[in-house]
Interface confidence: low
């Protein structure tokens, strides 16, 4: 009688486009063989997956978000057949580039300043605020009301995975019109992907000096 | 004695449609991954559709895809395949296989197979 | 789709000679290959899977061999009932894809 098989992985938290995933399909059986699904698919061909070992170990060479799984493992011989049970994988990931919402660029005077920002990320990141360069909160949506010409200026979102060691983040140019009407979206908004608080500056900077030279 | 009957299998006009049937016995049926295989009057051995021992998980090849649905009754240890939009090059003997193990098994059992011949 | 090339597509033999028919799959399969064997008039049966391993009742004459993209069967002191055709399938998920046989025949 076959033993259940198992999988034994050497990083369930493995970090997309770093980590290699090795699994391994226990225990060691004689004259057994082998067999991988991912998805309750059969093991489809790519670069990225190898078997090695007598089709005991499957390496994942790069992980990406994709491949969380379930992979399970089968183990067969003349007599008998057994399966593992599921194993899905925690890949960390991110965070991708933030996204601003609403788009608007342009906004009247009184009127509140809602923003949320948004980041594909596992874990959730960490969101923080800068306004013109200076850290205001450490919240995913910044709530301003009834808004004034002094608040005119470049909002960046801030995103950081402490599990991948990685952030990025983007930068809007708000502008708060005085006026009945308010004024077209003439504002310049640049995004930015960067790798610490130095690239919001850096995109800021950008920002106000397009903005002052329009 | 395990055993895998086709039926249905009969003499079709081009653009019509068919139902097989595989009455499976002497196994259990409902832990086997099972598929349907043809073959050609060439003498050519295609792989036409799978599902899963569930009955949830289903593949075709592009060449029948969209015209044949695979389906099954574990109560009545039965396979099917609904065959329509029929072509001439559809003519075959059909068998109802039994994958030995899951989807990455090979075709352990076939049956005695059903003639389906596609002429105007 | 990976494509099965088998080879020869004919051989003609004596009984108690070695005969060995090849197959080549258009990609890494790795071992997910199987060998069938189908008398006239008769339905194909499994001979062997995972590239090497024999079903239960076939006898140790045959043997299968290879990995990745090259496969080979052997059959060794070839008997009068292993006269028929062979069939070589991979079974690395789908589509599965057969090798166009081979016939083997009595010299």
């Known amino acids: 009688e076959l033993p259940k098989p198992y999988i034994s992985s050497n990083n369930s938290n493995p970090i997309e486009d770093k980590d290699a995933v090795t699994l391994t399909c226990e225990p060691v059986a004689e004259n057994t063989t082998y067999l991988w699904w991912v998805n309750n698919q059969s093991l489809s061909v790519s670069p990225r997956l190898q078997l090695s070992n007598g089709n005991r170990i499957l390496t994942l060479l790069s992980v990406t978000r994709n491949d969380t799984g379930p992979y399970e493992c089968g183990i067969q011989n003349s007599e008998s057949a057994k399966r593992s049970d599921p194993v899905t994988l925690n890949v960390t990931y991110g965070p991708d580039t933030p996204i601003i919402s609403p788009p608007d660029l342009s906004y009247r005077s009184g009127a509140n300043l809602n923003l949320s920002c948004h980041s594909d990320s596992n874990p959730s990141p960490q969101y923080s605020w800068l306004i013109n360069g200076t850290l205001r909160q450490h919240t995913q949506v910044l709530f301003i009301s009834k808004i004034t010409s002094n608040n005119n200026g470049a909002y960046a979102c801030f995103v950081s995975n402490l599990a991948t060691g990685r952030n990025n983040s983007i930068v809007k140019n708000i502008s708060v019109s005085s006026g009945d009407s308010a004024p077209g979206s003439s504002g310049l908004s640049a995004s930015g992907s960067g790798s610490g608080l130095n690239d919001i500056f850096e995109a800021q900077k950008i920002e106000w000096h397009h903005h002052h030279h329009h | 004695e395990l055993q895998l009957v086709e039926s249905g299998g009969v003499l079709v006009k081009p653009g019509g449609s068919l139902k097989l049937s595989c009455a499976a016995s002497?196994?259990?049926?409902?832990?086997?991954?099972m598929s349907w295989v043809r073959q050609t009057p060439e003498k050519r051995l295609e792989w036409v559709t799978y599902i899963n021992s569930g009955g949830g998980i289903t593949y075709y090849p592009d060449t029948v895809k969209g015209r044949f649905t695979i389906s099954r009754d574990n109560a009545r240890n039965t396979l099917y395949l609904q065959m329509s939009s029929l072509k001439s090059e559809d003519t075959a003997i059909y068998y109802c296989?039994?994958?030995?193990?899951?989807?990455?098994?090979?075709?352990?059992?076939w049956g005695q197979g059903t003639l389906v011949t596609v002429s105007a | 789709d990976i494509q099965m090339t088998q080879s020869p597509a004919s051989l003609s033999a004596s009984v108690g000679e070695t005969v060995t028919i090849t197959c080549r799959a258009s990609?890494?399969?790795?071992?997910?290959l199987a060998w069938y064997q189908q008398k006239q008039g008769k339905s194909p049966q499994l001979l062997v899977y995972?590239?090497?391993t024999l079903t239960e009742g076939v006898p140790s004459r045959f043997s299968g061999s290879g990995s990745g993209t090259q496969f080979s069967l052997k059959i060794n002191s070839l008997q009068p009932e292993d006269f028929g055709s062979y069939y070589c399938?991979?079974?690395?998920?789908?589509?599965?894809?057969f090798g166009s046989g081979t016939k083997l025949e009595i010299k």
């Open positions: 399938q991979h079974h690395y998920g789908t589509p599965f894809t």
């Open positions: 995972n590239a090497k």
């Open positions: 990609e890494n399969i790795y071992s997910y």
């Open positions: 296989t039994a994958h030995y193990f899951g989807s990455s098994g090979p075709f352990a059992y």
């Open positions: 002497g196994f259990a049926f409902s832990s086997y991954d």
